[in-house]
């Protein structure tokens, strides 16, 4: 009686059971009641990842400097090649399909996490006591200066785009 | 030990203007910020503003902002906090409070004044 | 401006009761440099000033019972009394001071059950 379900990296075709071309490996053949299934590499610049019956391989996605991307992981036969972007640049998408800039955090905020390649800059506000005076995707918020263990006085308050303006102690107000 | 002593209740008609005072000791009074809250009846507290006495440095909540004006006088070690334009909306309990004193780690308040009694009435 | 948003507004309770209020913000009060929480508790009584229970979200005022605790990060927090005393029943208020103005929560009253 033919079978209705294979195992596991099988598949079913007229009526009985062939085994799958393995990743990095396109189907040529299907098998016959004499023969095994015919399998051949795939060829440079493409690439199948799994257990499969496809005829033909992925073309191995081309990572476009004009569009700020470039090779993070060489593909195989078995891989896809992974595009990454350019420094100062972070994908648009999970895909990564193309780049743009890195965003700033604006002065009254500071990096609370540098941007990377996927990713874009993480911005938080600068809290009391600390400030930054840059647009910048790098600088987290800085410590206002303590007048304290200078042996000077405030003489102007700082805010989270200041710092703080020390004076002398005998300072006349 | 921290205290701030603040002055007596005080009774206002609308549109005229109150000023309370809060003498702070037991610490360095020009380098730690005085804040200032209000607390109408049965109501929350709501921060006005604060200065640091040694340098005249202040903030104002927006709501305030050109109707309050806090100073400080540190031969005294007096905070003042003066209220215009009254109305009688701005009935309530005015509390001083210390803020922080320098270290910028201090930003709560630990110490407050008793409080002083202003109701704007005609 | 920050927001602080309490719950609940108030609470019956006895005396032995774990009683535990909770404050939200609007935005994240946690500082990423020093991973601190820029957030206080206060106790008030009646015709009395507030009195700081709890700073840096966790840390116990000196002075202030152990039953008083706080927890939480970021956005949402805790206060949490062990077990409930007769000199508890009071009204408590969070406060954010991460950046100005600095705003308070609008209270949560512990009353007798």
């Known amino acids: 009686e033919p079978p209705t379900a294979c195992r596991e990296k099988q598949y079913l075709i007229n009526s009985q059971c062939c085994s799958l071309c393995q990743p990095g490996q396109k189907l040529v053949s299907d098998c016959t009641e004499f023969t095994e299934t015919e399998c051949l590499p795939c060829g440079e610049s493409e690439f199948l990842d799994t257990w499969n019956r496809e005829t033909r391989c992925h073309q191995h996605k081309y990572c476009d400097p004009n569009l700020g991307l470039r090779v993070q992981q060489k593909g195989t036969s078995e891989t896809d090649t992974i595009c990454t972007c350019e420094e100062g640049l972070h994908c648009t998408s999970e895909s990564c399909e193309s780049c743009v800039p890195h965003r700033s955090c604006l002065p009254g905020f500071g990096v609370k996490q540098i941007a990377t390649g996927v990713s874009d800059t993480i911005c938080e506000p600068c809290p009391v006591g600390f400030f930054s005076n840059v647009s910048s995707a790098f600088e987290k918020c800085r410590p206002w200066t303590s007048c304290e263990t200078k042996d000077l006085v405030v003489q102007q308050a700082g805010t989270n785009k200041t710092d703080v303006v020390c004076g002398p102690q005998d300072r006349q107000r | 030990q921290v205290q701030l002593v603040q002055s007596g209740a005080e009774v206002k008609k609308p549109g005229s203007s109150v000023k309370v005072s809060c003498k702070a000791s037991?610490?360095?009074?020009?380098?730690?910020?005085i804040e200032w809250i209000r607390q109408a009846p049965g109501q929350g507290l709501e921060w006005m503003g604060s200065i640091l006495p040694g340098s005249g440095s202040t903030n104002y909540a927006q709501k305030f902002q050109g109707r309050v004006t806090i100073t400080a006088d540190t031969s005294t070690s007096t905070a003042y906090m003066e209220l215009s334009s009254l109305r009688s909306e701005d009935t309530a309990v005015y509390y001083c409070?210390?803020?922080?004193?320098?270290?910028?780690?201090?930003?709560?308040?630990?110490?407050w004044g008793q409080g002083t009694l202003v109701t704007v009435s005609s | 401006d920050i927001q602080m948003t309490q719950s609940p507004s108030s609470v019956s309770a006895s005396v032995g009761d774990r009683v535990t209020i909770t404050c939200r913000a609007s935005q994240s009060l946690n500082f990423s440099v020093n991973q601190k929480n820029y957030l206080a508790w206060y106790q008030q009584k009646p015709g009395k000033a507030p009195k700081l229970l709890i700073y840096w979200a966790s840390s116990l005022q000196s002075g202030v019972p152990s039953r008083f605790s706080g927890s939480g990060s970021g956005t949402d927090f805790t206060l949490t009394i062990s077990s409930l005393q007769p000199e508890d029943f009071a009204t408590y208020y969070c406060q954010h001071y991460y950046s100005y103005p600095w705003t308070f929560g609008q209270g949560t009253k512990v009353e007798i059950k």
């Open positions: 037991g610490y360095t009074f020009s380098t730690s910020w």
């Open positions: 409070a210390r803020g922080d004193d320098g270290s910028y780690v201090r930003w709560y308040f630990d110490h």
